[in-house]
């Protein structure tokens, strides 16, 4: 059986996020069975975690991971040195910044230590799998008597996100959304003074600076106004 | 919060030098691509110099005339500016980019994605 496999992910690029190829083989054998696919997410440019389903394995396997960077100065077969754990079998590897060249392609290949034609390679385009940390030090301020300006902080370099802001009301079933640009401010201009608003954020690797599809986590809400004291509508209230 | 504050900018007559700072908060510039655009009256924004992965890229027209620097322990960047003439004359902005981007990836830039520059005026 000679099989070779190149699949692209599909992750919203003209070229794809990774590829996979798993070397050929010449007989029906353990080393025929796929190799788990590698999931990358680089978090906040801080470090990167490449994990795999070890469960997929038909026998509990350690599984190895080397990578490096094709066509760069980087481009010597490293050796994972961190790896996670899942029910003490290896589950992933993690990566520190400076391991991290986000605008080189990373070529990541997994491999059984006891079948060593058992292996899969794949090529990510690190910048489209970048994930902020959640956005920070939200805050309200009345621009006029019905209109408020949400504010709030990123750990990253600002013109490298875009937001989304949602907002609802206590009366309201469903979110209201916003998409924001890397400006990071969104102003409401009509505001209920009965009523009492929570407000929300997120935040993305897109467009200036990669193009990646995942949201951070939802920021810690914050709330305005008073669902309570009927005699000032007014009367406002921070939340973190 | 991420913030670069320049500082350093003033007139000047042609000939003369200046020193632009910025002073970086929030991240380390030591990680980062960090280097200087500038915008001059009715001009698009224009790169004058970046640090990219090892390599430093300056624009044509300011070649062995302005040299960028960095002191990490400060997280401050500079930009020297000798021999500066009229056309130099622009709001200079400090700029940083995730690590690596302006060498291989880099595309154009706003000014406005940045801080609020500082200005640079050089009279005949």
């Known amino acids: 059986l000679n099989t070779t496999i190149l699949t692209p992910n599909g992750n919203e690029d003209t070229t794809a996020d990774f590829f996979l190829t798993t070397m050929p083989t010449d007989s029906l054998s353990v080393s025929t069975l796929p190799l788990p696919e590698v999931q990358c997410f680089v978090f906040n440019v801080e470090y990167m975690n490449c994990t795999w389903n070890s469960s997929s394995e038909p026998q509990p396997t350690n599984l190895t991971l080397h990578y490096w960077y094709k066509n760069s100065d980087n481009d010597k077969v490293q050796k994972c040195s961190h790896y996670l754990f899942s029910e003490e079998i290896t589950s992933g590897c993690q990566l520190q910044k400076k391991e991290i060249h986000l605008y080189q392609t990373f070529v990541v290949q997994l491999q059984d230590p006891r079948e060593p034609r058992r292996q899969a390679t794949q090529m990510l385009k690190l910048q489209n799998l970048v994930i902020p940390w959640a956005p920070e030090n939200l805050t309200l301020h009345k621009l006029s008597e019905s209109q408020l300006e949400l504010n709030w902080n990123n750990r990253f370099l600002n013109h490298c996100l875009e937001h989304l802001v949602q907002y609802r009301t206590d009366w309201d079933h469903s979110w209201t959304e916003q998409s924001v640009d890397y400006r990071h401010k969104f102003s409401l201009p009509s505001v209920d003074g009965q009523k009492r608003y929570t407000f929300r954020v997120r935040s993305r690797f897109n467009p200036l600076c990669g193009s990646a599809q995942h949201w951070s986590e939802w920021s810690h809400p914050i709330h305005w106004g008073s669902n309570t004291s009927k005699e000032n509508p007014f009367l406002f209230a921070l939340e973190a | 919060q991420v913030q670069l504050q320049e500082s350093g900018g003033g007139s000047v007559q042609a000939g003369g030098s200046l020193k632009l700072s910025c002073t970086v908060s929030?991240?380390?510039?030591?990680?980062?691509?960090m280097g200087w655009y500038r915008q001059g009256p009715g001009n698009e924004c224009e790169l004058v110099t970046i640090?990219?992965?090892?390599?430093?890229y300056y624009a044509d027209s300011v070649k062995g005339r302005f040299t960028i620097s960095q002191d990490n322990a400060k997280n401050t960047v500079y930009l020297q500016m000798n021999s500066l003439k009229p056309e130099d004359t622009a709001v200079y902005y400090c700029?940083?980019?995730?690590?690596?981007?302006?060498?291989?990836?880099?595309?154009?830039?706003?000014?406005?994605?940045w801080g609020q520059g500082t200005q640079v005026t050089v009279s005949s």
């Open positions: 700029a940083a980019e995730p690590r690596g981007y302006y060498s291989n990836y880099g595309g154009r830039r706003e000014c406005n994605y």
């Open positions: 929030g991240f380390t510039a030591d990680d980062s691509d």
């Open positions: 640090s990219s992965d090892g390599s430093t």
